[in-house]
Amino acid sequence: KLLQVSTIAMQQQEKLIQQERALLNFTEWKRSCALQMKYCQAFMQNSLSSAHNSSPCPNNWIQNRESCYYVSEIWSIWHTSQENCLKEGSTLLQIESKEEMDFITGSLRKIKGSYDYWVGLSQDGHSGRWLWQDGSSPSPGLLPAERSQSANQVCGYVKSNSLLSSNCSTWKYFICEKYALRSSV
């Protein structure tokens, strides 16, 4: 009888471990989905708000090709900057090419001068790889020039005509980006 109870207890224990594992996997999946959901909402919000607006970019945004850019007038830490962009139906700037980098730095010179602006680039804590917010790697010519001495999480920012890195928990301006509305002519 005692052996039977012991076996049942072990089976229950095993079942509990499996459930805990499943719950952990589910939590990770949910977190990943929540982030993807945010991006989808940002994209949808952008599409819907653009549909009511004939200009390719909202007021106070700058257009270059198929992108609209917003240069903030407020300081935030990196994570809050990302949230601020999401509220506007956009994401932190993702620089795809040298041409785009040149446009951004040229525009910043005209607008504000030599300040720091967060972009959507962060360093993976485990591998040390730089990743854009969509999970892609920056092209070799668009890697931050200096490695931050910070032991904390490290994120990318633009200053003058350089891409640099800093502790994500410092305050900087930021740049948001979203798709420009195609004019339906």
């Epitope: 007038e73 407020i74 300081w75 935030s76 830490i77 994570h79 809050t80 900057s81 601020n84 928990s169 305050w171």
Partner: nanobody
Framework: QVQLQESGGGLVQAGGSLRLSCAAS????????MGWFRQAPGKERGLVAA????????YYADSVKGRFTIFRDNAENTVYLQMNSLKPEDTAVYYC???????????????????QGQGTQVTVSS
């Protein structure tokens, strides 16, 4: 758009005191948190002190605790930073800051976004 005008900076001997003032205009002052940032040459900008909309909650960087006091006068739309026992390492440009969105929260100043003034230079000589 909020406008912030700092005053009270200057040159002071180590051990001395200064009081920085910041007059805010452009919106309802009493519903927003206010703060002071500073940036020394070659250093990151950092939050020195912050105060909630009600004055019920304050934040101080470890390096200034016990020496600096932040307080606000909602009737006058002004926030102050009283700086005592100043040290050479307090030398920096000090920026007044206003919370970008009136969240009504008391704490957690770290994750807020801030409008900032033009800055006022504070130099502490030894």
């Amino acid at each position: 758009q909020v406008q912030l005008q700092e005053s009270g900076g200057g040159l002071v001997q180590a051990g001395g005191s200064l009081r920085l003032s910041c007059a805010a205009s452009g919106r309802t002052f009493s519903t927003y948190a206010m703060g002071w940032f500073r940036q020394a040459p070659g250093k990151e900008r950092g939050l020195v002190a912050a105060i909630s909309w009600s004055g019920g909650s304050t934040y101080y960087a470890d390096s200034v605790k016990g020496r600096f006091t932040i307080f606000r006068d909602n009737a006058e739309n002004t926030v102050y930073l009283q700086m005592n026992s100043l040290k050479p390492e307090d030398t920096a440009v000090y920026y007044c800051a206003a919370e970008a969105e009136g969240s009504g929260r008391e704490g957690n100043f770290y994750e807020r976004s801030w409008y900032q003034g033009q800055g006022t230079q504070v130099t502490v000589s030894s």
